[in-house]
Interface confidence: medium
């Protein structure tokens, strides 16, 4: 697909543009903003806490252009990349290079997308072709999930209730997925 590659702050080689409007979560844009969730938690010892609300993972904001064949969005969209090791929220770094990383023994904890939002984008096409409108899925919040030794990556287990702020402006989900507290949605760029 002729993806352009460049290095971001973490020196990872990544695609700038993709066929589908969501690059894999591990691929970060060069315009990232690191933020640790749920600061100011009560000071429990990280290795003794049983309160799952103590656990969280990093959310990186990144911007990218949406492409569809030769067409590209007029403006970049902003979404989240779920990144980093899940652990006690108070130990997650507030900025790159600060804070301590905590790694649990036993099961693997992964930071993965939790909620999505839909956003309409206007795609501009070359050669005088009419602009196209597309609705894209964007990651709106992340959560920790537990991957047991006996399961592959498609069988991630919910790690309790996510340590996250309530999501704004969202109706309760009618389907019987567990109701979770969710982070505020990213503002639409349009």
């Amino acid at each position: 697909q002729g993806w352009q590659a460049f290095k971001n702050d973490a020196t990872e080689i990544i695609p700038e543009l993709g066929e589908y409007p969501e690059p894999p979560p591990e691929l970060e844009n060069n315009k990232t903003m690191n933020r640790a969730e749920n600061g100011g938690r009560p000071p429990h010892h990280p290795f003794e806490t049983k309160d799952v609300s103590e656990y969280s993972c990093r959310e990186l904001h990144f911007t990218r252009y949406v492409t569809d064949g030769p067409c590209r969005s007029a403006k970049p969209v902003t979404e989240l990349v779920c990144s980093g090791q899940c652990g006690p929220a108070r130990l997650l770094p507030n900025a790159i290079g600060r804070g301590k990383w905590w790694r649990p023994s036993g099961p693997d904890f992964r930071c993965i997308p939790d909620r999505y939002r839909a956003q309409r984008v206007q795609l501009l096409c070359p050669g005088g072709e009419a602009p196209r409108a597309r609705k894209v899925r964007l990651v709106a919040s992340c959560k920790c999930k537990r991957l047991t030794r006996f399961h592959n990556q498609s069988e991630l287990k919910d790690f309790g209730t996510e340590a996250a702020r309530p999501q704004k402006g969202r109706k309760p989900r009618p389907r019987a997925r567990s109701a979770k507290a969710n982070q505020a949605e990213l503002e639409n760029a349009y």
């Epitope: 993709g18 909620r115 839909a118 894209v136 899925r137």
Partner: antibody, heavy 117, light 111 residues
Framework: QVQLVESGGGLVQPGGSLRLSCAAS????????LSWVRQAPGKGLEWVSN????????YYADSVKGRFTISRDNSKNTLYLQMNSLRAEDTAVYYC??????????WGQGTLVTVSS | DIALTQPASVSGSPGQSITISCTGT?????????VSWYQQHPGKAPKLMIY???NRPSGVSNRFSGSKSGNTASLTISGLQAEDEADYYC???????????FGGGTKLTVL
């Protein structure tokens, strides 16, 4: 051209298991969400499950949650559906579909799963 | 559960226009403004006919068009032809997980 080819369907007894596969070609597999959609004989389409590009996010219809597991192998360009504790009401043609821009732009030809004793 | 409601059947004569409706709750069609339509002939896989309310994929006849008003989306087929006889399904996505949901389907009979 984009192609999705399902396999693995067949006759299975209630309570049994089956694993469906969907081999994809003609597009950048790892750049797309994928879904399984089923259709019981003489009935309408029912979305079953979907999975994001790297397999880290998976979602299921209430009717199959806890029994079915969707997964993918991007190195093999293959989508899977592991079906356990099968019931008679799971009898259907199962389609894999490419889930692009929140609609299904390409579908496989389907594979029939029959759950009967 | 969220549901999209379609009429079970519609019919029309060759050359006529018909409209199939798809009504949903505010958490799918009404709020999200994104409805797709699929055509399915007996024994065949569904085929995408309309996406994002009113967009046609390349290769789909311009006799097919989509629209939406409030929480009801509509598929209109003008100049009905015999080969249009098929089942038609609307589809949207629901909730903050953006999982997919289909209407119950409408059987179109060309008289």
């Amino acid at each position: 051209q984009v192609q999705l080819v399902e396999s693995g369907g067949g006759l299975v007894q209630p309570g049994g298991s089956l694993r469906l596969s969907c081999a994809a070609s003609g597009f950048t597999f790892r750049s797309h969400w994928l879904s399984w959609v089923r259709q019981a004989p003489g009935k309408g389409l029912e979305w079953v499950s979907n999975i994001n590009y790297d397999g880290s996010s998976t979602y299921y219809a209430d009717s199959v949650k806890g029994r079915f597991t969707i997964s993918r192998d991007n190195s093999k360009n293959t989508l899977y559906l592991q079906m356990n504790s099968l019931r008679a009401e799971d009898t259907a043609v199962y389609y894999c579909a490419r889930d692009t821009y929140l609609h299904f732009d390409y579908w496989g030809q389907g594979t029939l799963v029959t759950v009967s004793s | 559960d969220i549901a999209l409601t379609q009429p079970a059947s519609v019919s029309g004569s060759p050359g006529q226009s018909i409209t199939i409706s798809c009504t949903g709750t505010s958490s799918d069609v009404g709020d999200i403004n994104d409805v797709s339509w699929y055509q399915q002939h007996p024994g065949k896989a569904p085929k995408l006919m309309i996406y994002d309310v009113n967009n046609r994929p390349s290769g789909v006849s311009n006799r097919f068009s989509g629209s939406k008003s409030g929480n009801t989306a509509s598929l209109t087929i003008s100049g009905l032809q015999a080969e249009d006889e098929a089942d038609y399904y609307c589809q949207s996505y629901a909730g903050s997980y953006l999982s997919e949901v289909f209407g119950g389907g409408t059987k179109l009979t060309v008289l």
